[in-house]
Interface confidence: medium
């Protein structure tokens, strides 16, 4: 028998520095977690103790903090090289700055293979990107070889900016011939490493003949056997065992997100490459693990540029940006409109001639807007200003919801109106009318939504049975501020870009902004 240790991360999202327990900015260092310096300590410890170790990343290193905003992926290549990753799969966020923003900073600079079997380049891009990412890679590990085959969410064109010259194929259809090829090369130990979410990971384990282990990402799935060490609630045991269609037991793993844990999976193979046993658990990278001093020093050196960036002007406002709780928790506020407009703008994807865009709607809890911005400071808007407005380090995510769920959400928005509570919704691509004289749960008297399948966008009545795409803060997608109906009834959830980054990009693009209060939210007293 031959034993392999798989160390894995996924959805690190630019958390190069240690973070608080909830993966936001580290405040009290004695209670902080993760970060590449601490990760390196643990990885090195395991590499020294065990003979056959692979360090793998399942995608979405890009996007999430000011690190990515400033360094645009160069930081990912630099620190992943420093940690000596063995392979990485492409995630959807790796395309956030377009194909060029992937090729130059990461693909050309990485000293490890970057993989995806279901992304096919065409046209002029095919020769430009050739060899910079691969469908699979055979890695020597000790006296053996291990095949790593990559995959990426086929929803990427809707979630990021891969352009028109990359085709995202069905994962299972694309993986099978690559695995078959590895088999013909006498590679009998194969890991599928990819970024399509836990449900697809399980399907790959079930359907793709010859895959021995699946290491996934995208859905931020936390798996754990025994008592979990922090706040995350396990979605299942680690590893999650799937019985394949040909009768094999295939371990599937994922390691939550944000570099908080290091996935640790020990696999035992027989001489024919069959998995005999698999066990392990994610390792919580808490403060009991010291940060490696050389990596930490490097982090501090790179950090200097970030501090300078946060005070630079992004753009100007010629109007007061009213982010006060007195406005945003009671009525339409222009800061809410600005943020929602930025959220929609960030999700413009013209992927279908029938649709002007795939999503037109935004909702945003008023309590998430924490500060106004005064235009009398020469109109200047900086990252620092935006960090005061959006201090929680969240993301703006894409969900799919039924109309009936949206209706419930808007009822919740005003169910205890007048108490300055955070659940009052700011909107984009939505016209809502409330009648506060009616009892809670029955106050939404009109809800019109901007069409997507139209050449001239116009407002249509919400259809209860229809499925809509909506951009919202991850806080709401996770049921925050009492929006349990969103968490319970959402049909799909894809994590998006860092909130501040979305707004700062929009302001930089617009140069001068002047958001108005324009009748998106109205109050009426109806007849009957």
């Amino acid at each position: 028998a031959w034993e392999l240790t798989i160390l894995h991360t996924n959805d690190v999202h630019s958390r190069l520095e240690q973070t608080s327990e909830d993966s936001s900015k580290c405040v009290n260092a004695s209670r902080c977690m993760g970060g590449v310096a601490r990760l390196f300590t643990k990885v090195q410890q395991i590499r020294r103790a065990e003979p056959n170790v692979l360090l793998l990343d399942a995608g979405d290193q890009y996007q999430g903090t000011i690190w990515f905003t400033v360094y645009k992926g160069a930081e990912v290549a630099h620190f992943m090289n420093a940690l000596r990753y063995d392979a990485m799969a492409l995630g959807n966020h790796e395309f956030d700055n377009g194909v060029e923003g992937l090729i130059e900073p990461l693909l050309k600079e990485a000293k490890f293979p970057i993989l995806s079997a279901n992304i096919k380049a065409k046209g002029p891009l095919a020769s430009q990107i050739s060899g910079l990412y691969l469908p699979y890679k055979v890695l020597p590990v000790g006296d053996e070889v291990v095949g790593i085959v990559g995959y990426t969410s086929k929803e990427t064109p809707f979630l990021s900016n891969p352009g028109t010259n990359l085709v995202f194929e069905d994962e299972i259809t694309a993986l099978q011939p690559e695995v078959d090829k590895l088999k013909t090369l006498n590679v009998n130990k194969i890991i599928a490493l990819g970024h399509s979410g836990f449900e697809m990971d399980k399907l790959i384990a079930q359907k793709v003949r010859g895959v021995d282990v699946v290491v996934g990402g995208h859905s931020n799935t936390f798996l754990y056997t025994g008592n979990p060490p922090s706040k995350e609630v396990p979605a299942g045991k680690y590893p999650f065992i799937v019985t394949s269609d040909d009768g094999r037991k295939v371990p599937v793993v994922q390691a939550y997100a944000f570099g908080k844990y290091l996935g640790y999976l020990k696999i035992e193979f027989d001489e024919r490459g069959n998995v005999i046993s698999s066990h392990g658990n994610p390792i919580l990278l808490n403060s009991s693990i010291p940060e490696d001093p050389s990596i930490k020093a490097d982090i501090n050196k790179w950090r200097i540029k970030l501090d300078n960036y946060s005070t630079q002007e992004l753009g100007k406002t010629i109007v007061y940006l009213d982010g006060s709780s007195q406005s945003c928790r009671f009525r339409e506020c222009n800061m809410g409109n600005l943020i929602c407009d930025a959220m929609i703008n960030n999700n413009l994807r013209h992927t279908d001639e029938m649709f002007w865009n795939h999503v037109s709607m935004c909702i945003l809890n008023g309590g998430g807007i924490r500060s106004p911005i005064d235009e009398r400071n020469n109109g200047t808007i900086t990252w620092e200003n935006l960090a005061a407005v959006l201090p929680f380090g969240g993301t703006f995510d894409l969900v799919q919801l039924k109309g009936s769920t949206l209706k419930k959400a808007f009822e919740h928005s005003v169910h205890r109106y007048g108490q300055s509570t955070g659940e009052f919704l700011q909107v984009g691509g939505i016209h809502v009318v409330y009648d506060l004289s009616r009892k809670p749960g029955d106050r939404v008297v009109k809800l019109d939504v901007l069409c997507t399948k139209c050449r001239v966008p116009s407002y249509d009545p919400l259809k209860m049975d229809e499925v809509y795409k909506v951009i919202l803060p991850n806080f709401l997608a996770n049921g925050g501020d009492g929006f349990q109906m969103i968490k319970d009834e959402l049909l799909r959830h894809d994590s998006g870009d860092q909130d501040i980054n979305v707004v700062s990009t929009y302001i930089s693009k617009m140069k001068v902004i002047y958001p108005a209060v324009e009748g998106r939210i109205k109050f009426s007293t109806g007849s009957h």
Epitope: S404, D435, D442, K446, Y459, P461, L462, K463, H528
Partner: antibody
């Protein structure tokens, strides 16, 4: 398939009562307001009554107010029209119709996007 | 008597553009949105236009609605024989606190 099927029509003497029913299928019934609309022989459409998704808002045309009662049973996906003190001028084809919205208010007025085939009510001695 | 009025009949030849109008008051058309329904002979009405000018899915773009002041109109371009039907406008009426239909216009395709 979205469908509305009316029943309960028939021949009735003036002053008597009749109860119309409408069975809904193919959509989430309790998400929408519902209406009764009638059409006298050779005449135009006349809105009779409407009811919001949760029965909190109810409206009637002046011509039937006080005599007709609209109700719904969301558990049974059914709409009803109780017609009392019937008159000859109530003779018509009665349609059940689904609203595009859930409310029965001026602010949420869109229109009726699904109609049944109608049930005939004849009031005659 | 009907509070929203329509001309009883209209006609046109195939391929022609026909306009059907609807007149009301400030309490209905003037202050609220207008719908249009088509009723083919012997069938139930069908929603053609809502919110003055919006077409439900499946309604051809030959049908268009507009509203100005206390009047609304339905235009049918490229008239076809299957467009022969009764057309009704409808609106919310503030003074009646309910919905009102126009008297209907019978469209004949010559």
């Amino acid at each position: 398939e979205v469908q509305l099927v009316e029943s309960g029509g028939g021949l009735v003497q003036p002053g008597r009562s009749l109860r119309l029913s409408c069975a809904a299928s193919g959509f989430t019934f309790d998400d929408y307001a519902m209406h009764w609309v009638r059409q006298a022989p050779g005449k135009g459409l006349e809105w009779v009554s409407g009811i919001s998704w949760n029965s909190n808002s109810i409206g009637y045309a002046d011509s039937v107010r006080g005599r007709f009662t609209i109700s719904r049973d969301n558990a049974k996906n059914s709409l009803y029209l109780q017609m009392n003190s019937l008159r000859a001028e109530d003779t018509a084809l009665y349609y059940c119709a689904k609203d595009m919205g859930w409310e029965l208010l001026k602010t949420s007025y869109y229109g009726m996007d699904v109609w049944g085939q109608g049930t005939t009510v004849t009031v005659s001695s | 008597q009907t509070v929203v009025t329509q001309e009883p009949s209209a006609s046109g030849t195939p391929g022609q553009r026909v306009t059907i109008s609807c007149s009301g008051s400030s309490s209905n058309i003037g202050g609220n949105t207008v719908n249009w329904y088509q009723q083919l002979p012997g069938t139930a009405p069908k929603l053609l236009i809502y919110s003055n000018n919006q077409r439900p899915s499946g309604v051809p773009d030959r049908f268009s609605g507009s509203k100005s002041g206390i009047s609304a109109s339905l235009a049918i371009s490229g008239l076809q024989s299957e467009d022969e039907a009764d057309y009704y406008c409808a609106a919310w009426d503030d003074s009646l606190n309910g919905r009102v239909f126009g008297g209907g216009t019978k469209l004949t395709v010559l």
